[in-house]
């Protein structure tokens, strides 16, 4: 039989499906797959779901460059551009479109659960009410192209279909142990007790990084994460905010010890010589092991929040290291200078 009847469906909000692996719960962040380490290379755009970037966004790529060096296998070819967010994972910015709530409809109507969104930081450009959570750093679709145009997405280098190994390369000024030693030995004041020093940027209790500088984050191909535990703890630590599909991952006891080494060195790497104030600083490569997959399937509603490090994990781990990896040496100008130089060097590299 020819399906000629008009197919009308209605919704509370246009496209407010939630993501995740629990029934009717929305809003996980980041795209990866739980089965092995496939994915992150192809974007949701490639599968034709999620937000619709404008040609300007696709070409100019209002996309924040990833700050990590991706080492990955080659992926399948495509004529769609690929982009990654600052966390090295693929992202998508969802337009804040929302259709007015519908009334009772036909039997085949698909109703989509409405979400009560918090006010977005960025005003929607689509002229519709905001659809979901805080979108700082994301932009809505740009102006439509010329009606009827058939321009294709510019071709960019093929992304990986495998989960890239992310390595943050930390370049520090060439170490000269002797020079560093001599500088430190001239310190006129005794070294401060590092255990009680607060970081320049803030102690780990206040370490809350919320990336917001990116513009349009385009997620590559949606992928599946339905059974993976969160990077920062078990599912018990994932708190769903019904208001917008936004998930804040809270970790009460986040132990970085076996996954992260500080850029300049944790206290484990600082040897205190009582007499001479001699400090040995070992610079390590910052390595994040991707041993925990993030939780999202195709996701269109991607709002990434870095885990909050609440409370001191242990006085040995990060308590003396600032969020930039520098050590607060307020009472030691020489060491502070060295730390500042390292920080400046890192800053030059965008780290």
């Amino acid at each position: 039989a020819e399906p000629r009847q008009e197919f009308e469906v209605m919704e509370d909000h246009a496209g407010t499906y939630g993501l995740g692996d629990r029934k009717d719960q929305g809003g996980y962040t980041m795209h990866q797959d739980q089965e092995g380490d496939t994915d992150a290379g192809l974007k949701a755009e490639e599968a034709g779901i999620g937000d619709t970037p404008s040609l300007e966004d696709e070409a100019a790529g209002h996309v924040t460059q990833a700050r990590m060096v991706s080492k990955s296998k080659d992926g399948t070819g495509s004529d769609d551009k690929k982009a990654k967010g600052a966390d090295g994972k693929t992202k998508i910015a969802t337009p804040r479109g929302a259709a007015p709530p519908g009334q009772k409809g036909q039997a085949n109507a698909t109703r989509i659960p409405a979400k009560t969104p918090p006010a977005p930081k960025t005003p929607p450009s689509s002229g519709e009410p905001p659809k979901s959570g805080d979108r700082s750093g994301y932009s809505s679709p740009g102006s439509p192209g010329t009606p009827g145009s058939r321009s294709r997405t510019p071709s960019l280098p093929t992304p990986p279909t495998r989960e890239p190994k992310k390595v943050a390369v930390v370049r520090t000024p060439p170490k000269s142990p002797s020079s560093a030693k001599s500088r430190l030995q001239t310190a006129p004041v005794p070294m401060p007790d590092l255990k009680n020093v607060k970081s320049k940027i803030g102690s780990t209790e206040n370490l809350k990084h919320q990336p917001g500088g990116g513009k349009v984050q385009i997620v590559y191909k949606p992928v599946d994460l339905s059974k993976v535990t969160s990077k920062c703890g078990s599912l018990g630590n994932i708190h769903h905010k019904p208001g917008g599909g936004q998930v804040e991952v809270k970790s009460e006891k986040l132990d970085f010890k076996d996954r992260v080494q500080s850029k300049i060195g944790s206290l484990d790497n600082i040897t205190h010589v009582p007499g001479g104030g001699n400090k040995k600083i070992e610079t390590h490569k910052l390595t994040f092991r991707e041993n925990a997959k993030a939780k999202t399937d195709h996701g269109a509603e991607i709002v990434y929040k870095s885990p909050v490090v609440s409370g001191d994990t242990s006085p040995r781990h990060l308590s003396n290291v600032s969020s930039t990896g520098s050590i607060d040496m307020v009472d030691s100008p020489q060491l502070a200078t060295l730390a500042d130089e390292v920080s400046a060097s890192l800053a030059k590299q965008g780290l």
Partner: antibody, heavy 119, light 111 residues
Framework: QVNLRESGAEVKKPGASVKVSCKVS????????MHWVRQAPGQGLEWMGW????????KYAQKFQGRVTMTRDTSITTAYMELSSLRSDDTAVYYC????????????WGQGTLVTVLA | SYVLTQPPSASGTPGQRVTISCSGG????????VSWYQQLPGTAPKLLIF???QRPSGVPDRFSGSKSGTSAPLAISGLQSEDESDYYC???????????FGGGTKVTVRS
């Protein structure tokens, strides 16, 4: 309410072209991808490709490369799918389907357009 | 032939539980989320399950999806006569660079 309304049935001869339209209402047209899926009589569903309603960028299934053209007119919130060099096995119901934005799938479908290719 | 494999038919009596399998490979189900569609005779498909196990509002909770490895079954518990329909699974395929569907499963409710 979201509504995808497709054009009426078409009868074509082999070698001809057909252009099916999908008029959209109830949501921001440019905020979603539009996919085209076809279904031959008594057969399953077959994905043909998508068009980014905002930018006009397209992606086509390998099988239809060179024969299909997807366009859209944002001023009238309508997407089009044109299939050329028609063959008898192109006889099918052609559906437009909206790509979900916050989930993985096609959340709304048009009612379908039957295209019959007769020798 | 279809990239995703579904049984051509499945049946049950009212109140029974019916499970429809959908199997694929590492490039599709193994690495991407699955959606399910219900197509009543003579109508367009309707989204039934998205992102493996999510139900759009309005879809009865008798329908449940899951995914394990390269297989993604759809379960219908408490089968009802109105569930008599064709069911299709779909996902993105990394290798084919396109969406792929299963061949469809016709569910019959025996009275």
């Amino acid at each position: 309410q979201v509504n995808l309304r497709e054009s009426g049935a078409e009868v074509k001869k082999p070698g001809a072209s057909v252009k099916v339209s999908c008029k959209v209402s109830g949501y921001t047209f440019t905020g979603y991808y539009m996919h085209w899926v076809r279904q031959a009589p008594g057969q399953g569903l077959e994905w043909m490709g998508w068009i980014n309603s905002n930018s006009g960028a397209t992606k086509y299934a390998q099988k239809f490369q060179g024969r299909v053209t997807m366009t859209r007119d944002t001023s009238i919130t309508t997407a089009y799918m044109e299939l050329s060099s028609l063959r008898s096995d192109d006889t099918a119901v052609y559906y437009c389907a909206r790509g979900a934005r916050d989930g993985y799938g096609f959340d709304y479908w048009g009612q379908g357009t039957l295209v019959t290719v007769l020798a | 032939s279809y990239v995703l494999t579904q049984p051509p038919s499945a049946s049950g009596t009212p109140g029974q539980r019916v499970t429809i399998s959908c199997s694929g490979g590492s490039s599709n189900i193994g690495s991407n989320a699955v959606s399910w569609y219900q197509q009543l005779p003579g109508t367009a498909p309707k989204l039934l399950i998205f992102t493996n196990d999510q139900r759009p509002s309005g879809v009865p909770d008798r329908f449940s999806g899951s995914k394990s490895g390269t297989s993604a079954p759809l379960a219908i518990s408490g089968l009802q006569s109105e569930d008599e329909s064709d069911y299709y699974c779909a996902t993105w395929d990394d290798s084919l660079n396109g969406w792929v569907f299963g061949g469809g499963t016709k569910v019959t409710v025996r009275s």
